[in-house]
Interface confidence: medium
């Protein structure tokens, strides 16, 4: 329950009255305003718009509202020289070009400054080649095409579709197998669902949609020139050789149309299964090169992007607490957009803008919270989470020593079927509480809590009656406070029916369709989901800043801590001979696992206890629960991923969207039977198996009585 | 609900020339390729020419070729198919079509203009 008694307010300044004053109205007209221009980063409309929020923000009653910038590495394309993908005959003659442009949505014709489809932080070069059609250039895809059919991808241009993993990813398998190009393509069984009309008759992308999108593979290093530190006006920057993270080879996006031309031809290997073919009608044929009469033509790119150095601006409000000021709670969202940003991030910075006029309200009134909400609207996130991650750099030795928590906003929706939540195992009954008192939005659950319809809708795969919350992967920002400094965080949407839409995302995903309009006609005409989703989030925020005790609970990380040992066990296990011959043991790890939940439970019932009027042993229970998550931190990092240091989690290393539980054991048996060094590979398994023992063991003992 | 009407069919002599017109109506038409396809009288269904969404790329059956010009008016949803130097072997009855490129995703069909190339 939440407890105001600290903060000396009226009865009448709750979470009731900050729910309250939470309008769907407002989100709207929030989201129409913000969505009216493009907000690409870098680009003098979006420091306008900076300037618009943190203007906004001061006037809703925030204590200060600060612009905060730095000069990171951008990409765009060469306005006089645009990108393109051709077929090319024996003589070199460009038989077919690809779209320069999206046919822009009614009503957005005469609109300047829509970035052409591209793929941010491409390197230039003009390679032509044969085509290798590579399904979505999983690591898995890249297993079936070189192992099983001896295809060579050396030299070749490939062709990718999206979906599933993280674009960047597929780059870097591509580049791995020796692609000397990459086209990614948005196929209709991934992005269009049946019996769903196109844009802007539906929601469903048109042949000529396109998917832009970073392709980087920075692994939470923030700006690529600036590892580690803020890109400020003193940073030392990196040259472009040693930057991190950048693509080696093109790479260049395109819709299905432009795809048909290019699949349609290809000869060589069928498919290997079912699970290769889209729903395009060509035979999704491998390759290399394309079929009989016409196996003298090749693919082109074209490209001829730039990487500049460019300023971004987060906005960060503070809102200060009145008992604990030195301690943060976090709700962070991204501005910038690839074009209008209909949902992503619009739909999230409107609610985060109404989740602030809310708390300003209150504020104005006398109240404040107990400890201190920091705000932010972050820039360049589209670019590789640059802003929130340049901030958090600048600011590490605050937030590492005061953060309490970090709630995530970017996109409110993905779909309109139920709600989605990730988060750190520390907050689950903080969500489940929370969901409890909010009403579900969804037809058919009228009068019934948000935690019913979610239940029902998306049931938990192991505790019934419980609904299903997901581990943190990446993506998004709140990556640097997770991954990086050990902050609890945590993210809520709403989101599709899984069952039914096996398409990846949202159809019109990062394309010039995602309007306002969208979202308005198609996803959430009356905005209660936005509504639902500005009360999750907000309300997920002012218990954290306001109850007297943090409302983390220490067992359900214990429970999660042996679902994880247990499959990583049964991961290993599935080498028997090996784990004999090397003598590998999991005993250290089940020990540390059971005596943190030993640990976690008596600290438990201490808290239940404890003299809540001492503001000494008030402060002594909190920090040990605020550092809990900080003890999952390892200061040196995953193997060579030194900004990924949190040993319980990290983004999967075959897709950064993906959280992997104990990552350093994982990574140390994937594909382990391949390695050339059988005693080598195994004993890293076993000095990961000690990393993530002693982390455990370490982080319990600072549940344990302080003396 | 789709429609697509098509108009300016006739009777021509060898060698002149018509020009069919099809309206559409009840989807976007910008973001469709669109299709000539025509049956003639007793023969099974040929593809004649298709265009892409946005009027860049044409494509010709062999025996239409340098004769016969697909375009499309995207701001007045039209499609067009300019026919010169037209023979007796091109009378059937043609069709505007919007095929889908998508497995399982319908086709639409207009009812169709009758093209009779006689002297």
């Known amino acids: 329950k939440s407890s105001n008694e600290a903060t000396n307010i009226t009865p009448k300044h709750n979470m009731k009255a900050f729910l309250d004053e939470l309008k769907a109205e407002n989100i709207k007209k929030f989201l129409y305003n913000f969505t009216q221009i493009p907000h690409l980063a870098g680009t003098e409309q979006n420091f306008q718009l900076a300037k618009q929020i943190q203007s906004q923000w001061k006037e809703f009653g925030l204590d200060s509202v600060e612009l905060a910038h730095y000069d990171v590495l951008l990409s765009y394309p060469n306005k006089t020289h645009p990108n393109y993908i051709s077929i090319i005959n024996e003589d070199g003659n460009e038989i077919f070009n690809t779209s320069l442009f999206e046919p822009p949505p009614p009503g957005y014709e005469n609109v300047s400054d829509i970035v052409p489809p591209f793929s941010a932080f491409s390197p230039q070069g003009m390679p032509e080649g044969d085509l290798v059609y590579v399904n979505y250039a999983r690591t898995e895809d890249f297993f079936k095409l070189e192992r099983d059919m001896k295809i060579n991808c050396s030299g070749k241009i490939v062709i990718a579709r999206y979906g599933k993993v993280f674009r960047g990813n597929k780059v870097k398998n591509a580049q791995l197998a020796g692609a000397k190009g990459v086209i990614l393509y948005s196929d209709p069984a991934d992005y269009f669902a049946p019996g769903v009309k196109s844009y802007p008759d539906g929601w469903n992308l048109p042949g000529g949609g396109v998917q832009r999108g970073n392709i980087l593979n920075l692994n939470g290093a923030g700006d690529p020139l600036t590892p580690g530190y803020p890109a400020n006006e003193y940073a030392y920057r990196r040259g472009i050789a040693e930057a991190v993270g950048l693509p080696s080879i093109p790479v260049h996006p395109i819709g299905y149309y432009d795809a048909q031309k290019l699949l349609e031809k290809m000869g060589g290997s069928a498919p290997p299964d079912s699970s290769w073919r889209g729903s395009l009608k060509v035979p999704y044929n491998v390759g290399p090169g394309f079929t009989g009469n016409f196996s003298t033509q090749k693919v082109k790119m074209h490209i001829h992007s730039t990487n500049e150095v460019t300023r971004i601006y987060n906005v960060i409000g503070t809102l200060r607490g009145a008992v604990e000021p030195d301690r943060y709670v976090i709700l962070g969202g991204h501005r910038d957009s690839w074009v209008f940003g209909g949902i992503d991030p619009q739909s999230g910075a409107a609610v985060v803008h109404e989740i602030v006029r809310s708390f300003g309200t209150l504020k104005k009134e006398g109240w404040r919270p107990r400890r201190t909400i920091l705000f932010a609207s972050w820039d360049a996130e589209e670019f590789g989470l640059l802003g929130s991650t340049e901030w958090a750099e600048e600011n590490s030795r605050l937030l590492q020593e005061r953060g309490v928590a970090y709630i995530n906003a970017d996109s409110s929706i993905e779909g309109n079927y139920t709600l989605r939540v990730d988060c750190t195992p520390l907050m689950y009954s903080l969500v489940h509480n929370l969901t409890k008192e909010l009403k579900s939005p969804d037809e058919g659950f009228e009068g019934k809590s948000l935690y019913e319809s979610w239940t029902k809708k998306s049931p938990s795969p192991e505790f019934s009656g419980m609904p299903r919350i997901s581990k943190l992967g990446s993506g998004n920002d709140f990556e640097v406070f997770f991954q990086r400094l050990g902050i609890a965080s945590g993210r809520a949407r709403y989101t599709k029916n899984w069952e039914t839409n096996k398409f990846s995302g949202y159809p019109l995903y990062h394309s010039v369709y995602e309007t306002y309009e969208l979202v308005e006609k198609f996803y959430d005409p009356m905005f209660k989901y936005h509504l639902t989703v500005a009360q999750v989030r907000g309300g997920m925020v002012f218990e954290l800043a306001n109850s007297i005790v943090l409302p983390f609970d220490c067992r359900d990380y214990a429970v999660v801590l042996r679902k994880y040992a247990d499959k990583i066990y049964s991961i290993s296990m599935k080498h028997p001979q090996e784990m004999k011959t090397y003598s590998v043991s999991f005993d250290s790890l089940f020990s540390a696992v059971k005596n943190f939940t030993e640990i976690a439970s008596k600290f438990s019932e201490r808290l239940q206890d404890f003299d809540k009027s001492n503001p000494i042993v008030l402060r002594m229970m909190n920090d040990q629960l605020m550092f809990l998550e900080r003890a999952f931190i390892d200061p040196l990092g995953l193997p060579d991923r030194p900004f990924y240091r949190h040993v319980i989690y990290a983004p999967s290393s075959h897709n950064k969207y993906a959280g992997e539980s104990f990552p350093g054991i994982y990574d140390a048996l994937f594909d382990i039977e391949s390695k050339v060094d059988p005693s080598k590979a195994w004993g890293e398994v076993k000095r990961q198996i000690y990393v993530a023992a002693f982390t455990v063991q370490a982080a319990a003992e600072t549940l344990s009585e302080v003396a | 609900e789709v429609q697509l009407v098509e108009s300016g069919g006739g009777l021509v002599q060898p060698g002149g020339s018509l020009r069919l017109s099809c309206a559409a109506s009840g989807f976007t038409f910008s973001s469709y390729w669109m299709y000539w396809v025509r049956q003639a009288p007793g023969k099974g269904l040929e593809w004649v020419a298709n265009?892409?969404?946005?009027?860049?790329?044409?494509y010709y059956v062999d025996s239409v070729k340098g004769r016969f010009t697909i375009s499309r008016d995207n701001a007045k949803n039209s499609l067009y198919l300019q026919m010169n130097s037209l023979r007796a072997e091109d009378t059937a009855v043609y069709y505007c079509?919007?095929?889908?490129?998508?497995?399982?995703?319908?086709?639409?069909w207009g009812q169709g203009t009758l093209v009779t190339v006689s002297s």
């Open positions: 079509a919007r095929d889908s490129l998508i497995v399982g995703e319908r086709g639409y």
């Open positions: 265009i892409n969404h946005i009027g860049s790329e044409k």
